[in-house]
């Protein structure tokens, strides 16, 4: 049902769902300290831009009795119990922002009347894609898919001169929310990335994977998984790995890669890791001291989503126009905004875009170097590295068949 | 009121060093990350170095390397510190809210600081 929002004369109002089953363990007190860090800063800029207004944040905590398991099974329910709970009290703002996992903003966004904007860290999932109302300051299953896509096509690069057409797909069930959905969109059989590819095969063993790396009689080369280096060692262990297998590791909330003491261990050196461009800088601030560098991206978009509401706020306000419409409601995509770490650009239908970063382990140095960039604004890669020191023959990556090209 | 006062400026040797400074009203420092800019006689105002909210810093392509931007929460100040400085180095160095801030916050700009590299 429609609820009034306390989003006028001079008073706006942000309702925070702090929902006990969130895409990344994290304590909800550190997602507070990131949305009051961000409405300082929004008080700041709007009070530069002479405009005399006040914003709060209402944070919405579920009672925890019934939907306790902590992850995003069970968030379906919760999202639309604290919907209802906002209903009941009368208390919407003129934004929400929370919902994080896929299945908890899918069913929000089906069962409310949307004339107000969603902000999501998180909500990965293909089924979340282009949500008139929804923006999403993570990078969502889609952008993955495309670059994949790009990735697979590209055979002009001094380091990939095939194109490629084949991969198995690890998917174990055990991944975390992002990684769930980023697997589930691969291995969708109506998605883009299917589509495309001329064989696709799903290993949801251990030892489906396992026997995979030395099978003469595979029917591709390419392996994507997703996690970090940890998750594919308890994997993969020091195993033998035929000398043309490629590992694609999807760990884009990682950026421990960069630092300058990280050695590679030896069981990457078949592994190609696709992240996203480091912040470098997220340890000083005061609401991510101690976060994981994943949790410190999950409280980072928080605090942008408040960011990103203030940036709209002053547009609107500066313009006389009223915030309680639809046009306000659609108008959070096709921008870039200042965000903490920089600015940040949401595409046509409110989704973050951002550089992906495709790493290789230097068999000279044993340290991760940048082979390529891909720019999901425009879907487009761009080489770094154009003599690689691969592990793969002649400095090539391999035809995605065996039998065809360098092996 | 924003405020940006920029100081440190001077002629120096090319190869040689200069710190700038820029004190800025607590208002624009607090909620926008600072950029430094330059302009060249007869050239357009151009960005060199950022330095984000959270002390995330980027650089244009041509001082990278050499110059380092700073920031004190403290003292309301972000500083450039120029190193290996080349000729065409020469400009008014200006501070302000980096891009891409709202126009109008970036409609008040200092009196900037000049920098001369020369022999």
């Known amino acids: 049902s429609q609820v009034s929002q306390n989003c006028h004369n001079g008073s706006y109002e942000i309702s925070v769902l702090m929902m006990g089953n969130s895409a990344f363990a994290e304590p909800l007190k550190n997602l507070e300290d990131a949305v009051n860090e961000g409405l300082e800063i929004v008080r700041g800029r709007l009070q530069n831009a002479g405009l005399n207004v006040t914003v709060n944040a209402t944070f919405m905590y579920s009672d925890g009795l019934i939907h306790n398991s902590g992850d995003c099974r069970s968030s379906t329910c919760e999202g639309l119990d604290l919907l209802r709970k906002i209903s009941n009290a009368q208390r919407m703002g003129c934004v929400l922002i929370g919902p994080s996992c896929t299945y908890s903003t899918f069913q929000m966004y089906l069962d409310t009347e949307l004339s107000y904007p969603m902000i999501s860290a998180g909500s990965f999932g293909l089924s979340c894609d282009y949500k008139e109302t929804l923006t999403r300051l993570m990078s969502p299953a889609r952008k993955l898919m495309y670059f994949l896509v790009n990735f697979w096509k590209t055979n002009d690069l001094p380091f990939k001169t095939y194109s490629w057409s084949t991969s198995y797909v690890y998917k174990n069930g055990t991944e975390t929310e992002d990684c769930f959905w980023y697997l589930n969109a691969l291995e969708a059989s109506v998605s883009y990335f299917s589509h495309e590819l001329g064989f696709k095969v799903v290993l949801r063993q251990d030892k489906e994977f396992q026997d995979i790396l030395m099978d003469h009689n595979r029917k591709s080369n390419v392996i994507i998984m997703c996690g970090g280096p940890e998750f594919l060692y308890k994997l993969k262990g020091d195993r033998a790995v035929a000398e043309d297998i490629v590992i694609i590791l999807v760990d884009l909330f990682n950026d421990q890669y960069f630092e300058d003491n990280v050695t590679a261990p030896d069981y990457m050196k078949n592994v190609l890791v696709l992240t996203l461009s480091p912040g470098n800088s997220l340890l000083n601030s005061s609401f991510s001291r101690n976060l994981s560098p994943t949790k410190r991206d999950f409280a980072l978009a928080y605090l942008n989503g408040i960011l990103l509401f203030g940036h709209m706020l002053k547009i609107f306000l500066e313009n006389g126009e009223n915030i309680t419409t639809p046009k306000f409601a659609h108008a959070f995509r096709n921008l870039t905004f200042e965000g903490y770490d920089g600015p940040v650009t949401l595409d046509d239908w409110g989704d973050v875009d951002s550089t992906m970063v495709l790493l290789y382990t230097s068999v000279d140095t044993k340290k991760y170097k940048v082979l390529l960039t891909y720019d999901t604004h425009v879907n487009k890669t761009y080489p770094v590295d154009m003599s690689p020191t691969f592990t793969w023959k002649n400095s090539k990556l391999p035809n995605d068949i065996t039998g065809r090209g360098p092996q | 009121e924003v405020q940006l006062v920029e100081s440190g400026g001077g002629l120096v040797q090319p190869g040689g060093s200069l710190r700038l400074s820029c004190a800025a009203s607590?208002?624009?420092?607090?909620?926008?990350?600072m950029g430094w800019y330059r302009q060249a006689p007869g050239k357009q105002r151009e960005m060199v170095a950022a330095?984000?909210?959270?002390?995330?810093?980027e650089y244009a392509d041509a001082v990278q390397g050499r110059f380092t931007v700073s920031r004190d929460n403290a003292k309301n100040t972000v500083y450039l510190q120029m190193n290996s400085l080349k000729p065409e180095d020469t400009a008014v160095y200006y501070c302000?809210?980096?891009?891409?801030?709202?126009?109008?916050?970036?409609?008040?700009w200092g009196q900037g600081t000049q920098v001369t590299v020369s022999s």
């Open positions: 302000n809210a980096g891009p891409p801030t709202a126009t109008s916050v970036r409609q008040y």
């Open positions: 607590s208002n624009i420092f607090r909620a926008y990350g």
């Open positions: 330095i984000w909210l959270s002390g995330r810093t």
